[in-house]
Interface confidence: low
């Protein structure tokens, strides 16, 4: 699995989407977990409804919510009030018994809110070719891991 980057702005919401084959994963609950260290376990953050047929209902754990479009095959995770400590590696998982298949590896990147770092002069707006280190900075943008990186969150 390649890693997909989702960028969000500190203090705002970030929506992470994980597409999957709806037939292959029919009847399976889904989960969102945080990778603890490079070789460590993936710690469950939130999972979809216990009843698969109710997976469309939003479930929440703190500032993280999850909902599953089982027909369309898209798992959506929303991180509210994004904070720097939310940055790190995560996984979308499909659960079957005690096993979990990885649907997508995700790197969440938290950008400083430009308004919190405004210069005395005019607010600088990036040009069209601007990048986060060359990547367009938008809310909730996702891409392959081409620019920018955040190491695994500290485990201590």
């Amino acid at each position: 699995h390649n890693t997909t980057v989702f960028q969000g702005v500190e203090g705002q919401s970030l929506q992470v989407s994980c597409p999957y084959d709806s037939m292959k994963h029919w009847g399976r609950r889904k989960a969102w977990c945080r990778q603890l260290g490079e070789k460590g376990p993936c710690q469950r953050v939130v999972s979809t409804h216990n009843l698969w047929l109710l997976s469309f209902l939003r479930r929440r754990n703190g500032s993280t919510a999850i909902t599953d479009d089982t027909l369309g095959g898209t798992l959506t995770i929303t991180l509210r009030n994004l904070q720097p400590h939310d940055a790190g590696f995560y996984q979308c998982q499909s659960l079957h018994g005690s096993e979990a298949d990885t649907l997508r590896k995700v790197l969440v990147e938290v950008l400083a809110d430009p308004l919190d770092h405004r210069d005395a002069g005019d607010l600088w707006v990036p040009g069209e070719s601007e990048s986060f280190e060359d990547a367009h900075v938008e809310h909730s943008i996702s891409r392959s891991l081409l620019e920018g990186e955040i190491p695994f969150p500290p485990t201590s």
Partner: antibody, heavy 123, light 112 residues
Framework: QVQLVQSGAEVKKPGASVKVSCKAS????????MNWVRQAPGQRLEWIGR????????NYAGKFQGRVTITADTSASTAYMELSSLRSEDTAVYYC????????????????WGQGTLVTVSS | DVVMTQSPDSLAVSLGERATINCRSS???????????LHWYQQKPGQSPKLLIY???NRFSGVPDRFSGSGSGTDFTLKISRVEAEDVGVYYC?????????FGQGTKLEIK
């Protein structure tokens, strides 16, 4: 402590290819970008490209696009830079350098460098 | 690409004196996240470059406090308050706000 150890000097003929390796230790190799930078005799440092070992994703400077391939073997914590269709102007010391990025906005600077690999292109 | 231009190309300073190196970029190095990714590297004869200053003014670990960086936008300065013999070498400014990363042509520091 962080260490980057590069392969030895190479002498190549024009038109040939060269592959330089960079073995990393002392940090989580797969979660920091690795850059390649070269320095021709008496010239400024020149950025070639970089790789994110955890995903295999790469960026290259336009000047080298199509002629350079940067790869990484996470199991061996080693990055590679292969340059093809060599010409005399490619004679330079080639460096690998880790790009530090601990948190958003933290650094994006090359904090540790390999010892350099001299590549000489001569007929 | 962002072009980095340093001045002077070389300078000779007496031990204990102050050295100032300037760096100008062809476009603003302020990133859309408001940070400025301008760094300074030192390369001693026969050695690999070493990171001195990152993000304009932050000294890298182990770098003596006689080294300081300043500037904003497109104009930046590296100062060595009291030059020591071990400071001899070439100093490069570099930007990582935009890919491709680019370096200045270098400033050679010598002792008078």
């Amino acid at each position: 402590q962080v260490q980057l150890v590069q392969s030895g000097a190479e002498v190549k003929k024009p038109g040939a290819s060269v592959k330089v390796s960079c073995k990393a230790s002392g940090y989580a190799f797969s979660s920091q970008w690795m850059n390649w930078v070269r320095q021709a005799p008496g010239q400024r440092l020149e950025w070639i490209g970089r790789i994110y070992p955890g995903g295999g994703d790469t960026n290259y400077a336009g000047k080298f696009q199509g002629r350079v391939t940067i790869t990484a073997d996470t199991s061996a914590s080693t990055a590679y830079m292969e340059l093809s269709s060599l010409r005399s102007e490619d004679t330079a010391v080639y460096y690998c350098a880790r790009l530090l990025r601990n948190q958003p906005g933290e650094s994006y600077a090359m904090d540790y460098w390999g010892q350099g690999t001299l590549v000489t292109v001569s007929s | 690409d962002v072009v980095m231009t340093q001045s002077p190309d070389s300078l000779a300073v007496s031990l204990g004196e102050r050295a100032t190196i300037n760096c100008r970029s062809s476009q603003s190095l302020v990133h859309s996240n408001r940070y400025t990714y301008l760094h300074w590297y030192q390369q001693k004869p026969g050695q690999s470059p070493k990171l001195l200053i990152y993000k304009v003014s932050n000294r890298f670990s182990g770098v003596p406090d006689r080294f300081s960086g300043s500037g904003s936008g497109t104009d930046f300065t590296l100062k060595i308050s009291r030059v020591e013999a071990e400071d001899v070498g070439v100093y490069y400014c570099s930007q990582s706000t935009r890919v491709p990363y680019t370096f200045g042509q270098g400033t050679k520091l010598e002792i008078k």
